[in-house]
Interface confidence: low
């Protein structure tokens, strides 16, 4: 049979050719009469055997990771006879592994973040790296990590790769690391081989940092003149942090006066400080407020960061503003009576210079003739007044002032002309009555009513009577319904058209105001030739055709 | 070289305050914390508090809370420490130290130091 | 007493290594930055280690800074006779929300 021991052949032998081992049959005496001979993939090229003795040779330099083993396989044959002396048989050459391989970290590139400041023993990634020699043989592939770079901030587990935070770390100081792992095989002993990877550790931010204003003091200012809602300036902090760790509110922690407010700019994280309340110069020129600045967002584990906000000293000086004239009143109503002299008072306004400088102020009345205006603000008349044709004015009143004319104010003035009892009262109309020939006594010939431009305090009453004469005459009566109007009435039968064609009848009207008014109106009565009815109609119809020139029959 | 410069001695009665002036030269003044910490006569350093200029942030140390304010002048890139209801222990060498732009982060230069003596 | 503890003295002959170390606790050392200052006879302190071992410019490397844990140590190598001064260890503290300094080192170089 066959005699052979496991052949082993060392990888990366440099020598031209290397003793494998032997291959024998025991049935070889030694005698060289048998010749060996090797088959398979290899055989020749790789390795060859002498064929008398059956020593195998690799003539070529191995690669144990390219291929680990070689299967073959070999004859032996009797040169004399010629035929075989053992069956042919396989056999297998095993190249052994020397260290020849450095440990590889094939999923570099390796990136990682992890938060800032995290607490010692913080995993952050975990490197691997490959060694292409035999895990089976020594140490060859057994690996240790260790840190080139990256102390004191991160370690390296030696055995896992597993990378932690070792110290704490501050992303505003420094926000990416590049670590540097070795991957040693031999466990690190001597004649080790070694690889290298770099890690690059992002920090990512934690709020860490409270909002700091820039300055302890910002000095603003603000015209009196500025609508509420005005942006009078704005204030900065600053924040370490970035993203919505540095998104920042601020706030008013001290204005006893509530006169300004703060908003946030969320875009540029600016402060605006805005006008809540108008200001006024001559009241108080300046202003003194504290703001504070926060993060928007704090999460509970970091408030140790956030104790006290900081906060910043805001003063405001308030400009001045040449402002117009302020009258004591927005509007004046004054009465008068009528029919009171030229030059008579009617009232005062009184408008001031609401600036520190107190000019004096000048006084005019826009478009009227009626009355004045003196330097006092004291309104007069220019004329009589009637209010019969006017009861009451609307004046434009102007001030100015007198250091700056430009500053104007105007107000309006309503003036109540007063009633007086100037006025008698009178007909209400023209009236021509009728009456007829054969009249009888008591027929009612007219009814007259009457005015007075006056007004009445209360309701007009009027008092109708007939004039002393025509009361004598008595071809007429009147009689007062005593509401405002009254009826006349014959006081005699018939009239005589030839003798008396026409009345005139005078009726004295008189009012009841204080002192009493009265008037003469004459009615005219005509004396007409009626039909039998005793209708009027026809006298009114001559009448008519009469003062148009035209006669009747 | 970054240089502080603080104010000369001074000599002060029990009760009374004391401030005393670090100028700052040579840097960015507004980016870095100021710390004071003072040394009586042998003995060692003691941490009083710290300033961030810029906004005027102060952390006092329990010890001196209520009686020490620290405040900055971004004009002139002075920071002052005044000390009040002063003590005979009081009296010692007080140092302003520039720190980092972390308040745990070491200090690199130290002032030339005042010495503030306590004495009726 | 201090939050930081330093043995109050040290000492060691020219050439000499020694150690000076600073106890704390998790607050402080155990999740902040540890520097140590020198202190010179009659002068203001100068940063000597920052950051746990860091080194500002001008410093020599026989002096190094180490932290484990809650505690921190300065080591000094090759002694001469300009080390002779007072160390201290500083470091932030969490809970205190304030810096805390060890009491001090004494360091004397003897002979």
């Known amino acids: 049979g066959w005699v052979w021991n496991q052949f082993f052949v060392p990888e990366e032998m440099n020598t031209t050719s290397h003793h494998v081992g032997r291959l024998r049959s025991d049935l070889d005496n030694g005698n060289n009469s048998f010749q060996y001979k090797l088959l398979g993939a290899g055989a020749g090229s790789t390795f060859i055997i002498d064929e008398r003795t059956g020593d195998i040779y690799a003539i070529e330099k191995l690669d144990r990771e390219e291929r680990s083993l070689y299967i073959l396989r070999a004859q032996v044959i009797d040169i004399t006879t010629g035929r075989a002396v053992e069956p042919e048989s396989e056999f297998v050459i095993k190249v052994s592994d020397i260290n020849d391989n450095e440990p590889k970290f094939l999923d570099e590139p390796y990136e990682a973040i992890v938060p800032e400041m995290s607490p010692e023993g913080t995993l952050v990634i975990q490197v691997t790296a490959s060694d292409a020699d035999d895990p089976s043989s020594g140490n060859n592939a057994r690996l240790l990590y260790s840190l080139l770079q990256g102390q004191p901030y991160f370690s390296v587990e030696p055995t896992t790769g597993v990378i932690r935070i070792s110290s704490k770390m501050d992303r505003e100081l420094q926000d990416e690391y590049w670590v540097i792992i070795q991957a040693k095989d031999m466990i690190g002993q001597p004649g080790a081989l070694s690889g290298t990877t770099s890690v690059l550790i992002k920090l990512s931010d934690v709020n860490d940092n409270k909002p700091i204003f820039k300055e302890s003091l910002y000095r603003l200012t603000v015209s009196e003149s500025a609508p509420t809602g005005t942006s009078i300036g704005t204030i900065m902090a600053y924040d370490n942090d970035i993203g919505e760790n540095a998104e920042m509110d601020y706030s008013i922690e001290e204005d006893d006066s509530q006169t300004f407010d703060i908003i946030t700019n969320h875009e540029t994280q600016e402060g605006i400080v805005i006008l809540k309340k108008k200001v006024n110069f001559e009241h108080q020129n300046h202003y003194g407020i504290r703001a504070k600045v926060k993060n928007h967002h704090v999460d509970k584990q970091l408030m140790k960061y956030h104790t006290e906000a900081s906060t910043t000293f805001i003063k405001i000086q308030v400009e001045d503003v040449d402002e117009p004239p302020l009258f004591l009143l927005p509007y004046y109503i004054f009465e008068i009576f009528e029919e009171t002299p030229q030059g008579s008072f009617v009232g005062v306004v009184s408008a001031t210079d609401p600036d520190n400088r107190k000019s004096p102020i000048r006084y005019s009345i826009t478009r009227s003739k009626v009355f004045n205006i003196d330097d006092n603000g004291t309104i007069t008349t220019t004329n009589s007044l009637d209010r019969e044709i006017s009861a009451w004015y609307n004046l434009s009143i102007t001030a100015t002032e007198k250091y700056n004319i430009e500053q104007i104010s105007s107000i309006p003035v309503y003036v109540q002309v007063l009633n007086i009892n100037d006025h008698a009262p009178e007909f209400s109309q023209y009236y021509e009555s009728y009456v007829c020939e054969n009249a009888g006594s008591g027929q009612v010939i007219q009814t007259i009513s009457a005015v007075d431009r006056d007004e009445s305090i209360e309701e007009h009453h009027f008092y109708f009577n007939l004039s002393v004469e025509d009361t004598n005459s008595s071809s007429f009566t009147i009689i007062d319904n005593q509401d405002n109007t009254a009826v006349i009435l014959t006081n005699r039968t018939g009239f005589n058209l030839q003798e008396e064609p026409i009345f005139y009848i005078s009726i004295l009207i008189a009012d009841n105001g204080i002192p009493s008014l009265t008037s003469t109106n004459t009615l005219t009565i005509h004396v007409c030739d009626c039909d039998d009815s005793g209708s009027t109609q026809t006298c009114q119809y001559q009448e008519l055709m009469l003062s148009m020139g035209f006669k009747t029959e | 070289q970054v240089q502080l410069v603080q104010s000369g001695a001074e000599v002060k009665k029990p009760g009374a305050s004391v401030k005393v002036s670090c100028k700052a030269s040579?840097?960015?003044?507004?980016?870095?914390?100021m710390s004071w910490v003072r040394q009586a006569p042998g003995q060692g350093l003691e941490w009083m508090g710290i300033?961030?200029?810029?906004?005027?942030?102060?952390t006092y140390a329990q010890k001196f809370q209520g009686r020490v304010t620290m405040t900055g002048d971004t004009s002139t890139s002075t920071v002052y420490m005044e000390l009040s209801s002063l003590r005979s222990e009081d009296t010692a060498v007080y140092y302003c130290a520039r720190g980092g732009i972390k308040l745990w982060l070491h200090f690199d230069y130290w002032g030339q130091g005042t010495l503030v003596t306590v004495s009726s | 007493h201090s939050v930081l503890t330093q043995s109050p003295s040290a000492s060691g002959t020219p050439g000499q290594r020694v150690t000076i170390s600073c106890s704390g606790s998790?607050?402080?050392?155990?999740?902040?930055?540890v520097n140590w200052y020198q202190q010179l006879p009659g002068t203001a302190p100068k940063l000597l280690i920052y950051t746990n071992n860091q080194r500002p410019s001008g410093v020599p490397d026989r002096f190094s800074g180490s932290k484990s844990g809650t505690s921190a140590s300065l080591a000094i190598s090759g002694l001469q006779s300009e080390d002779e001064a007072d160390y201290y260890c500083a470091v932030w503290d969490d809970s205190l929300n304030g810096w805390v300094f060890g009491g001090g080192t004494k360091l004397t170089v003897l002979g």
């Open positions: 040579r840097y960015t003044f507004t980016s870095y914390y």
């Open positions: 998790r607050s402080n050392i155990g999740s902040n930055f």
């Open positions: 300033i961030h200029p810029s906004g005027g942030d102060t």
